[in-house]
């Protein structure tokens, strides 16, 4: 309604003597800002003046407040939004109606707010879910309809009088919707906690109690139960009686069925909480409960462990592992039913009984072919001797034995003969299914274990063939001992150890790498011509004629071997030096002359130097001297120098005659 | 020190004869370890060997064989100055043209450089 | 006769070291251990660096160096500097009637 003033707050506010109440408050006036604001306690209308009557409890006008009786009241608001109140301290008197009364320039209103204070703190109130079961969490909330900045407050939880472990969030609320304390825990319970109180307690910022609200926790859980056997031991003979009883410690709700369980498995017929077992067999060792339930689900006992016991069953022998391998550990292990365990135990190798092996395990860390057969057992414990059963095989693997390679052939072997070998063993497990030789070679097998070695290599130097089954054992190599001819002949120049300069001393030496048999011939030649029949060859002073083409041949009882052509070079400083004249020693004026030096060198000239016939070097180091155009002047003679690595060497003068052309001897 | 100076006209007319000379100064003509060159450059033939004159017992020259037949090097001793004939000039034959010395001893060993240049001069072939 | 081929250009920064290849034939540079270089400033006339492959004249700073393999000569300049930025050229003696080639030229750039 557009003629009304807007305010909100909380419609009931709570507190209690000597605490204090804190009022949150907004309004909307009609028109313009606030004036004049009156608090009464109790207003009450009084048609006669048109005033409201009640007690004063605050009062402000335009001209200013007006100073109060009790400073205990104060307005928190302001002209136009806020009308926030706060009394501190709250009496029990201070019950009943507050009345605002708002004046604006043309508007009034009075706004009534209920204020509930006790004579003491009121208790708060717990809220608990609908239902509460084991080990699920649940939150504890309490309640208080009490917050006020002037007086801090604090609430507790305690289970069965004792503060509570678990850590609690406390909220306040001071708005104008709602005014409130709360505490939230977060709680996850136990069966044990059927039955047990839970406390709220209100105290004040010291910690002094101020009140309280309790209840009484009623957690669903499943049946609690604990499980007697007689004999205690639960340890029987075959054919003894046994009981079992199950008692129920706790049940929420109550239990609705009863059953038995034999290692998770569901008992017949066994409904009742005692569980008769007569004349009990080895089959009926094992873990027993009981299990009981109700609405919640099933709740099972701790576990018995019902031993019959009985005398040890026939023997098996579990062997780790087989086939074994020669050298590898192995674990014999003696298997038989019995209860208490055996404490005795009577190996077997082959029916004989192996001395000193009396416990479940016979270990033998290296295991030899002669280890290979039956082993079995016999196991013994306080109520009797098992019997013997039917054993296990042991079955030992190992490489061949003693591999030898033998040559078929007479002896010597030459090169280029055919060799046969074979490859013998004495004894294998599992049996050689294949042979390797070395080295490898593009031979021939003609059988198993045999070897062909078509056209022998002078290297083919020793062999070695191995037997294989799952393992290769290799035959210690055997020598061919081939016969060969010489081989890798070769020109080795011994002296000088740089070139071979023109004058220097010359050693040629015959080289090879190797002969069987080790007697050998050499022979040198020069150009198909004889030169000597000693492994050097010799030259005092060598000079460039005696440069060319050397081999020399190395021969045996088998054959002979030429090295390759050595190409024996001198070097020498040019010599035999010429200038040639192009096209000839006699040209007109005004023509081209080439100047040519001609040489012998080892190596070729590097460089050359020409000379005219006052012996004045030109600026020129090729080969060619060109002229051109030619002039008179040029006429005399000439030479040049050949310079190479070893050193120099000189032409003799040729002389270059000019001629005057016709137009010159015409024009004198 | 030895230096180079060029002289000579900067524009020739196509079919004339350019002319250059090359005045010697801290060393001979005559000197017969040096050879007196003469080189030229254009943006479109590069650095561009011409000829060269020298004097042992008596006078020699050699040219390049793209301009032998139309080039001739002369000397003037008592100017000690040595000059360029080139004829039949073409527009191609436009560019700056250098004299250069070419120091043939080392010492005792043969060596081959143009050590020395003249100030270079700017020859352009225009009608 | 062809003339000697040279990179067109190489760039290095001050303190670098940059090296400038010259290859030619075995009737030039391979055949004679005559290959000299010359650096050149823009309007300037050729100067002489490096004579004979490796052999420097007196005033030339000895961050300039050649070598030879061969039919290519090499030029390295050391310690780059800014007024190294020049063009450079090679030259060999050669057995033909023109006894004298150049090389292309090499534009070195200081960056």
């Known amino acids: 309604d557009s003629s009304k003033w807007v305010f909100e707050h909380p419609e009931t506010l709570y507190a209690w003597e000597g605490a204090c109440v804190w009022i949150p408050c907004t309004y909307r006036a009609l028109d313009g800002d606030l004036e004049s604001f009156i608090l009464f306690h109790n207003p009450e209308y009084n048609k006669n003046t048109s005033k409201f009557d009640g007690t004063r409890l605050y009062e402000s006008t335009k001209d200013g407040k007006v100073p109060s009786e009790q400073k205990r009241v104060q307005f928190l608001g302001d002209k136009n939004k806020n009308c926030t109140l706060s009394i501190h301290p709250v009496h029990l008197n201070d019950s009943g109606q507050l009345g605002l009364r708002m004046e604006s320039k043309t508007e009034k209103w009075m706004e009534r707010i209920h204020l509930n204070v006790s004579e003491r703190p009121f208790p708060p109130h717990i809220q608990l879910p609908p239902e509460i079961q084991e080990s699920q969490e649940v939150t504890l909330t309490c309640l208080l309809n009490f917050s006020c900045y002037g007086y801090p407050i604090q609430l507790q939880w305690l289970l069965e009088g004792v503060p509570m472990r678990q850590a609690a969030v406390t909220s306040t609320s001071l708005t104008i919707k709602s005014v409130f304390t709360r505490s939230e825990l977060k709680f996850s319970p136990q069966w044990s906690h059927h039955g047990k109180i839970v406390t709220c307690q209100l105290q004040d910022a010291d910690g002094k109690f101020l009140s309280n609200d309790t209840v009484q926790l009623n957690v669903k859980h499943t049946p609690k139960l604990e499980i007697k056997v007689t004999p205690s031991d639960a340890i029987v003979r075959e054919g003894d009686s046994v009981t079992m009883t199950c008692e129920v410690s706790s049940s929420n709700p109550e239990y609705t069925t009863v059953s038995w369980l034999k290692d998770g498995t569901s008992l017949k017929k066994q409904n009742t909480f005692t569980l008769n077992l007569r004349e009990v067999t080895k089959d009926q060792s094992g873990k027993y409960c009981c299990q009981v339930s109700n609405d919640v689900g099933p709740g099972r006992s701790e576990e018995v462990f019902l031993q019959v016991q009985y005398a040890p069953e026939p023997s098996t022998v579990q062997i780790l592992h087989s086939p074994a391998v020669e050298g590898s550990q192995v674990e014999f292990l003696c298997m038989s039913l019995a209860n208490p365990l055996p404490t005795n135990y009577t190996w077997y190798h082959n029916g004989k009984e192996m001395q000193g092996r009396t416990e479940e395990k016979v270990h033998i860390p290296k295991i030899l072919p002669w280890h290979a057969g039956t082993y079995s057992c016999v196991a013994e414990n306080i109520l009797g001797t098992g019997q013997r059963g039917p054993g296990a095989e042991l079955d030992v693997q190992y490489p061949p034995k003693k591999v030898t390679t033998v040559i078929q052939n007479p002896m010597p072997i030459r090169e280029g003969d055919t060799v046969t070998l074979s490859c013998n063993y004495n004894s294998s497990n599992p049996s050689v299914t294949r042979y390797e030789w070395k080295p490898h070679g593009a031979w021939e097998e003609p059988s198993l274990g045999v070897l062909k070695i078509q056209n022998v290599g002078w290297d083919n130097t020793t062999i070695a063939c191995a037997a294989c089954n799952s393992w290769c054992s290799w035959a210690s190599p055997v020598a061919l001992n081939v016969q060969y001819a010489p081989r890798d002949v070769r020109v080795r120049k011994i002296k000088p150890l740089s070139e071979i300069h023109s004058g220097n001393s010359v050693s040629l030496q015959c080289d090879f790498s190797s002969s069987h048999p080790k007697e050998v011939q050499f022979f040198w030649e020069k150009n198909g011509r004889l030169l000597g029949k000693e492994s050097q060859l010799n030259f005092d002073s060598i000079s460039p004629e005696d440069a060319g083409s050397y081999s020399c041949w190395v021969n045996n009882s088998i054959g002979q071997t030429a090295s390759k052509a050595w190409t024996l070079e001198v070097l020498y400083a040019p010599r035999r030096l010429r200038v040639s004249m192009s096209p000839g020693d006699q040209v007109m004026e005004g023509k081209s002359a080439t100047l040519t030096c001609e040489s012998d060198a080892n190596p070729p000239v590097s460089h050359y130097t020409w000379f005219d016939w006052n012996n004045q070097s030109l600026p020129y180091h090729s080969q060619k001297l060109r002229l051109e155009p030619v002039k008179v002047q040029h006429s005399g003679a000439y030479w040049c120098q050949g310079t190479n690595s070893v050193g120099k060497g000189r032409s003799p003068l040729s002389t270059l005659t000019v001629y005057y052309s016709p137009e010159t001897i015409g024009r004198r | 020190e030895v230096q180079l100076q060029q002289s000579g006209p900067g524009l020739v007319k196509p079919s004339q004869t350019l002319s250059l000379t090359c005045a010697i100064s801290?060393?001979?003509?005559?000197?017969?370890?040096?050879?007196w060159n003469w080189i030229r450059q254009s943006p479109s033939r590069g650095l561009e060997w011409l000829g060269r004159?020298?004097?042992?017992?008596?006078?020699?020259?050699d040219y390049a064989s793209s301009v032998r037949g139309r080039v001739s090097i002369n000397v003037d001793t008592s100017k000690n100055q040595y000059s360029l004939q080139l004829n039949a000039v073409t527009p191609e034959d436009t560019g700056v043209y250098y004299c250069?010395?070419?120091?043939?001893?080392?010492?005792?060993?043969?060596?081959?450089?143009?050590?020395?240049w003249g100030q270079g001069t700017m020859v352009t072939v225009s009608s | 006769q062809s003339a000697l081929t040279q990179p067109a250009s190489v760039s290095g920064s001050p303190g670098q070291s940059i090296t400038i290849s010259c290859t030619g034939t075995s009737s030039d540079v391979g055949g004679y251990n005559y290959v000299s270089w010359y650096q050149q400033h823009p309007g300037k006339a050729p100067k002489l660096m490096i004579y004979d492959v490796s052999n420097r004249p007196s005033g030339v700073s000895n961050r300039f160096s050649g070598s030879k393999s061969g039919n290519t000569a090499s030029l390295t300049i050391s310690g780059l500097q800014a007024e190294d930025e020049a063009d450079y050229y090679c030259s060999s003696y050669t057995s033909s009637s023109t006894l004298y080639v150049f090389g292309t030229g090499t534009k070195v750039t200081v960056l």
């Open positions: 801290g060393d001979s003509v005559l000197s017969n370890s040096d050879t």
């Open positions: 004159t020298y004097h042992r017992s008596t006078w020699y020259d």
């Open positions: 250069a010395r070419d120091r043939l001893q080392d010492g005792n060993s043969w060596s081959d450089a143009f050590d020395v």
